[in-house]
């Protein structure tokens, strides 16, 4: 099969500062030099992009500066944070992995992460 | 909204060259894939080549390799297909079709025609 | 390069009937690839079904995708005036994208 297999967790749970960390594996038909990494939000049938970081394999993930995102990658395994999330960023989160070269391009969609953000309640004011 | 519009179609003579161009707007076009898909008169759909976000990565149908030079201008949002020695079987309408982010082709210009005759 | 063949190569239907069209790859394509698309006479192709079985921004319900590994179908529930076209499937989980020779569904 010619297919690229993508798998990531269910679910995840952002934490109380809005940071939300997940792993994203695939399995690779190819020996692929190069990696797009994409990690999208599907909410109803609109898809966007969050952020995207392309890679030499051995090297490190890199995303652009102003970035919500943040990863680390090992192998066919690459760990995703995205930082900066409140409740209304509450989604499923799609991670997609592109193998760029050498040819042939594949291209692999995972099923999605569901990431649920809470907002922290806020501190109530403190007399002294 | 998002539009596709090619242009530079026209007859030409075997062996000769053209450059076909798609001008998108509507959207971010760097962080798009970008391809070029041809219909010969009659006939069914054909791939010819996609080109991704910052150019440095394209692939081609076999039968253009060679001959077919995909590029992408991101500053000017602009797709180009630069075909040399062509032949009459390269004879079809082009459209350029954007890659949306789960991979099909969602968005497609109104095409330009090629032909290639003596 | 994954070969894909589409049956019949011409289905005469009429208004109100259910069209059943099929898509059959030389290997195993992830449904997660698997797209359809209309065209009409003159005018470029519309992306109508992407991943096997999701509808495209503004398809309507009367359209619907099914299948996994070499077999797909597009299933048309009640056929339009305006739903007679060719249509086109096309795998595009890898290089080089693939378009079926298409079927062209026309007015009996």
């Known amino acids: 099969c010619k297919a690229m297999h993508v798998a990531q967790p269910a679910v995840v749970l952002a934490s109380s500062r809005g940071i939300a960390s997940f792993v994203c594996e695939y399995a690779s038909p190819g020996k692929a030099t190069e990696v797009r990494v994409t990690v999208l939000r599907q909410a109803d049938s609109q898809v966007t992009e969050v952020c995207a970081a392309t890679y030499m394999m051995g090297n490190e993930l890199t995303f652009l500066d102003d970035s919500i995102c943040t990863g680390t990658s090992s192998g066919n395994q690459v760990n995703l944070t995205i930082q900066g999330l409140r409740a209304m960023d509450t989604g499923l989160y799609i991670c997609k992995v592109e193998l760029m070269y050498p040819p042939p391009y594949y291209l692999g969609i995972g099923n999605g992460t569901q990431i649920y953000v809470i907002d922290p309640e806020p501190c109530p004011d403190s007399d002294f | 909204q998002v539009q596709l519009v090619e242009s530079g179609g026209g007859v030409v003579q075997p062996g000769r060259s053209l450059r076909l161009s798609c001008a998108a707007s509507g959207f971010t076009f760097s962080s798009y894939g970008m391809n070029w898909v041809r219909q010969a008169p009659g006939k069914g759909l054909e791939w010819v080549a996609v080109?991704?976000?910052?150019?440095?990565?394209?692939y081609y149908t076999d039968s253009v390799k060679g001959r077919f030079t995909i590029s992408r201008d991101n500053s000017k949002n602009t797709l180009y297909l630069q075909m040399n020695s062509l032949r009459a079987e390269d004879t079809a309408v082009y459209y350029c079709?954007?890659?949306?982010?789960?991979?099909?082709?969602?968005?497609w210009g109104q095409g330009t025609l090629v032909t290639v005759s003596s | 390069e994954i070969v894909l063949t589409q049956s019949p190569g011409t289905l005469s239907l009429s208004p109100g009937e259910r069209a059943t069209l099929s898509c059959r790859a030389s290997q195993s394509v992830s449904s997660s690839y698997l797209a359809w698309y209309q065209q009409k006479p003159g005018q470029a192709p519309r992306l109508l079904i992407y991943g096997a079985s999701s509808r495209a921004t503004g398809i309507p319900d009367r359209f619907s995708g099914s299948g996994s590994g070499t077999d797909f179908t597009l299933t048309i529930s009640r056929l339009e005036p305006e739903d007679f076209a060719v249509y086109y499937c096309?795998?595009?989980?890898?290089?080089?994208?693939?378009f079926g020779p298409g079927t062209k569904v026309d007015i009996k």
């Open positions: 079709a954007r890659v949306h982010l789960l991979g099909p082709f969602d968005y």
């Open positions: 096309q795998q595009y989980g890898s290089s080089p994208f693939t």
């Open positions: 080109i991704w976000y910052g150019g440095s990565n394209k």
